[in-house]
């Protein structure tokens, strides 16, 4: 490692420099200026071995204030200038872009194309139980049960579309009244934002970019769930939705046209139903109370089919069953009718991986889910790579301007309805919500894209989502066409109703507050995102679903205490955030409380304690790994997930000292300092433990 | 190719009980019906009952009910009505025969089994 | 129960007549018919089912015909070996019965 040069107005104690010491000047990091978004991350290094020097300047200087953790990186080119390179390093640099694109492209396809798989993971595990949720009688007098069971099924199977076509082909058949299946249409808008936060958990390893990641993907989830807050009451008080679309239905005369394009699907589907075709009627049979289909399997094993309809003999309970008098006779022992039956006749077997092994659902759906996420896990961290490779200097100026930039005064208020039309278009274009949000997840992680720029993009997608499922519904057959289009239109205007509640004014736009609260709890508990996970789309909708299940009264004697205690909580918080002395002083915090009631830190310590025996060989994995990338893509540098590097992060952190590394391959300190800019952590940075 | 054998001739007395049997070959035995018919002499033919040796279900004709039980052993292919209570208008000549698959029509017969009911 | 009536109730005829059998139904039996053949002192044998689907091994002179509440038995042209007594069945529902029998006598 390169000797780290004196400056003449050096700290004069030396021992703050060394491995080990007990305090070091608490310095605020610019985060303005932050060149990489990696963690806060201290570097091991062997004893009396130099950490970066501080600026004297810097730590005489008054604390300057804290920067917003939120404002975006600076994304900055390292590379050399065009105009500084010869015809032969244009050259390269020219092949190079178009490597990075092809590779870009490709790892984006893989990505959309594992999103895809781990849907049909996730039917294969849970689409049969899903089925079965919507089974239950009880649907149609309880609005929450409803909305739950929405919730469940939608993150059971992934896909808000497969669960919306099971609602449809219920109130088609009489099973559900359209009435009923709103709340469940909510429901399926809240369980489809679970898939842009899976893939903001990828993004787990760098604090900042998960602050924003993560951010970014709940600002999705809060807009649905305050949406039904407020939404889910109305609709169940004066049935706006369902009268509106009424009269829209009727007042049309609607002929069933094409089919909806399948934009993006048409690159995808030639490779993903080389993996797994599914047979999606089942669940839907499931539902429908089909007991055949509960032994039928997910698993499609024939693509070619010819349906045959024949008169074959069939036996009935009695005289009364017969088609007619005429067409029933007797064995002797049992009654006999003729009746039309349609014969399916097999003929091609399906192309995927699965179709010989004849493995039960469950585990075809395991072995599909742990593939698909590690697919979707190693695209996303390349797409990062590429996109932080890619996006610097000028090339992420000239982006994060034409991404984030407002029109100018007075019309910068239109910039957001923009935004919301490009969301809506890019979905409309990729056919999926959950493809389009997850895809921006990494770019708001990265900082291409700024919260406040992401909630309108996402809020698009959401009317986008509806958009295609409106066209669906205009395709689908005559007996369908009526129920499909009323809860599509049911469904666009349930998310255009939750956009006029929660984006016209700036005031109202409590997802994105909410979104980065969270965001700043995650990024320092990460285990926080975990549970939140798994409390909002798992826990309170199998709670409520249990509750319901019990009747009322359960509901209502267990409901009621809750959200009074959560409303209690919110406005004494309202008040001690806004008008404290209105309060008697103990209430003025939270200390009245036991610590585990209003910190996250004794469950931290918890948590720490069971995940402690995970952590070394995760580590160790994890290092071996990341020296494998970094090999791949020609940058061997340090990798900060050893124990002892996550230790000193955390322990550093917590005394509120910035942790720094040296970069390895350019000794910029000194620069750096005249500039007056103190360094966040870089992820180029030499790891002596390794 | 199939084949009914039917137990030999009986001659009972009033009261009495009997029980022919009905050993088939060169079929599955469970999968068809296997129905009783009976012609007293000179008459026409009279249907007594079936049994699907399947799963052991029967179906008796009311006039021949709680007088005939018809039973059949899986293990030796064999069918087997037995006749109670006899009577002297109980003299005929009983048939088994073969129940076609879905339908009453009836494709192989046994050779006949006369029962003669006499004091 | 549902009677079956046959008509005649005895038949003579010569070698290579054309003979038909009737047989009435008193309520509407569908096609559930079979017609058998039987010689004395034996055990009877399936001609047709379905009123008009003739058994395996029965010659083609043997037809059937018919629907509702009227069938017919049709020999086209009376061979030494016909001469027999002949019985409907229907198998409509239970209890399965048969007509009182049609008996083919040499002229």
């Known amino acids: 490692m390169a000797p780290w040069p004196e400056l003449g107005d050096a700290q004069p104690n030396p021992s703050k420099y060394l491995e080990g010491a007990t305090s070091q000047q608490p310095i605020t990091p610019d985060k303005s200026k932050e060149t990489n978004k990696t963690d806060n991350t201290e570097v091991p290094v062997t004893k009396f071995e130099l950490l970066p020097t501080y600026s004297t300047a810097t730590l005489i200087e008054e604390p300057t204030e804290v920067d917003d953790p939120w404002n975006l990186p600076t994304l900055q080119d390292s590379g050399i200038k065009w105009s500084e390179r010869d015809a032969k390093g244009k050259i390269l640099c020219v092949f190079q872009g178009i490597g990075r694109l092809i590779l870009l492209l490709g790892f984006l396809y893989f990505f959309v194309c594992s999103l895809d798989v781990l849907s049909s993971a996730f039917q294969l595990v849970g689409g049969k139980m899903a089925g079965q949720f919507f089974s239950n009688s009880s649907i149609m007098s309880n609005p929450l049960l409803g909305l739950v069971i929405g919730v469940l099924v939608t993150v059971f199977v992934q896909s808000s579309s497969t669960s919306t076509s099971i609602v449809v082909s219920m109130v088609a058949s009489s099973l559900l009244t359209v009435r009923a299946a709103i709340p469940i249409i909510m429901g399926a808008n809240i369980g489809t934002s679970i898939t842009n936060t899976i893939v903001a958990l990828m993004q787990v390893g760098d604090r900042s970019e998960f602050r924003r990641a993560f951010a970014g993907a709940t600002v999705h989830d809060f807009f649905n769930w305050l949406s039904v807050l407020v939404l889910l009451p109305v609709e169940v008080a004066t049935h706006y939705l369902e009268v509106v679309t009424q009269l829209i239905v009727e007042s049309f005369h609607f002929k069933n046209g094409e089919d909806a394009p399948d934009l993006l699907k048409v690159i995808t589907k030639p490779f993903t139903k080389l993996i797994v075709q599914l047979d999606k009627k089942v669940i839907s049979q499931i539902a429908m109370n089909d007991e055949t289909a509960k032994n039928k399997s997910l698993v499609k094993i024939w693509c070619k089919t010819f349906t045959n309809m024949t008169q074959m003999n069939v036996t009935v309970p009695s005289m009364a069953n017969c088609t007619s008098p005429s067409l029933c006779w007797t064995d002797g022992i049992q009654i006999w009718t003729m009746k039309n039956v349609t014969y399916k006749e097999n003929i091609a077997k399906c192309q995927h991986i699965f179709v010989n092994f004849h493995l039960p659902d469950l585990a075809v759906g395991i072995i599909l889910l742990i593939i698909s996420l590690l697919v979707l896990c190693g695209c996303l961290i390349m797409i990062v790579k590429i996109l932080g490779s890619v996006l610097k200097g000028q090339v992420a100026t000239v982006i994060k301007k034409t991404i984030n930039t407002d029109f100018p005064f007075p019309f910068a208020w239109l910039t957001g309805y923009l935004a919301i039309l490009v969301g809506a278009g890019m979905t409309f274009i990729v056919q999926s919500s959950s493809v389009f949000t997850s895809a921006l997840t990494p770019l708001i992680g990265i900082g291409v894209i700024t919260i406040e720029r992401a909630y309108p993009l996402t809020l698009g997608s959401n009317i986008g989502t509806t958009t295609t499922a409106i066209l669906a519904a205009l395709a689908s057959p005559g007996n369908t066409l009526r129920s499909s289009l009323q809860i599509a239109l049911c469904h666009f205007f349930f998310n255009i109703s939750g956009i006029l509640l929660w984006y016209p004014i700036p005031f109202t736009r409590l997802p994105i507050r909410m979104a980065k609260g969270l965001g700043n709890i995650s990024a320092k508990y990460r285990w926080f995102a975990i549970f939140y996970l798994i409390i909002f789309f798992f826990l309170i909708p199998l709670t409520v679903f249990g509750l319901s299940l019990a009747g009322w009264p359960v509901l209502v004697g267990v409901g009621v205490p809750v959200v009074f205690i959560i409303i209690l909580v919110l406005c004494l918080r309202l008040l001690q955030s806004r008008c404290p002395r209105v309060l008697p002083k103990k209430l003025q915090n939270w200390n009245f409380l036991p610590l585990c009631m209003h910190s996250l830190k004794p469950w931290d310590a918890v948590i720490s304690k069971f995940t402690g025996p995970f952590q070394m060989p995760c580590c160790c994995c994890c290092r071996v790994c990341c020296r494998v990338c970094c090999l791949l893509c020609g940058c061997p540098k340090c990798c900060r997930c050893s124990k002892c590097c996550q230790d000193l992060e955390e322990g550093q952190e917590a005394q509120g000292v910035p942790v720094k590394a040296p970069e390895t391959f350019d000794n910029i300190t000194i620069s750096r300092e005249a500039q007056g800019e103190v360094r966040a952590p870089d992820s180029k940075t030499e790891c002596t433990a390794l | 190719q199939v084949q009914l054998v039917q137990s030999g001739a009986e001659v009972v007395k009033p009261g009495a009980s009997v029980k022919v049997s009905c050993k088939t070959s060169g079929y599955t035995f469970t999968t068809n019906n296997m129905h009783w018919v009976r012609q007293a002499p000179g008459q026409g033919l009279e249907w007594i009952g079936a049994i699907y040796p399947g799963s052991g279900a029967t179906a008796y004709n009311q006039k021949f009910k709680g007088r005939v039980t018809l039973t059949a052993d899986k293990s030796t292919s064999t069918a087997y009505m037995e006749l109670s209570s006899l009577r002297s208008e109980a003299t005929a000549v009983y048939y088994c025969a073969r129940g076609m698959y879905g339908h009453g029509a009836m494709d192989y017969w046994g050779q006949g089994t006369l029962v003669t009911v006499s004091s | 129960d549902i009677q079956l009536t046959q008509s005649p109730s005895f038949l003579s005829a010569s070698v290579g007549d054309r003979v038909t059998i009737t047989c009435k139904a008193s309520?509407?039996?569908?096609?559930?018919v079979a017609w058998y053949q039987q010689k004395p002192g034996k055990a009877p044998k399936l001609l047709i089912y379905?009123?008009?689907t003739r058994h395996s091994g029965v010659p083609s002179r043997f037809s059937g015909s018919g629907s509702g509440t009227e069938f017919t038995l049709t020999i086209s042209s009376l061979q030494p070996e016909d001469f027999a007594t002949y019985y409907c069945q229907q198998y409509s529902s239970n209890p399965l019965t048969f007509g009182q029998g049609t008996k083919l006598e040499i002229k």
């Open positions: 379905w009123a008009t």
């Open positions: 309520q509407d039996v569908g096609t559930a």
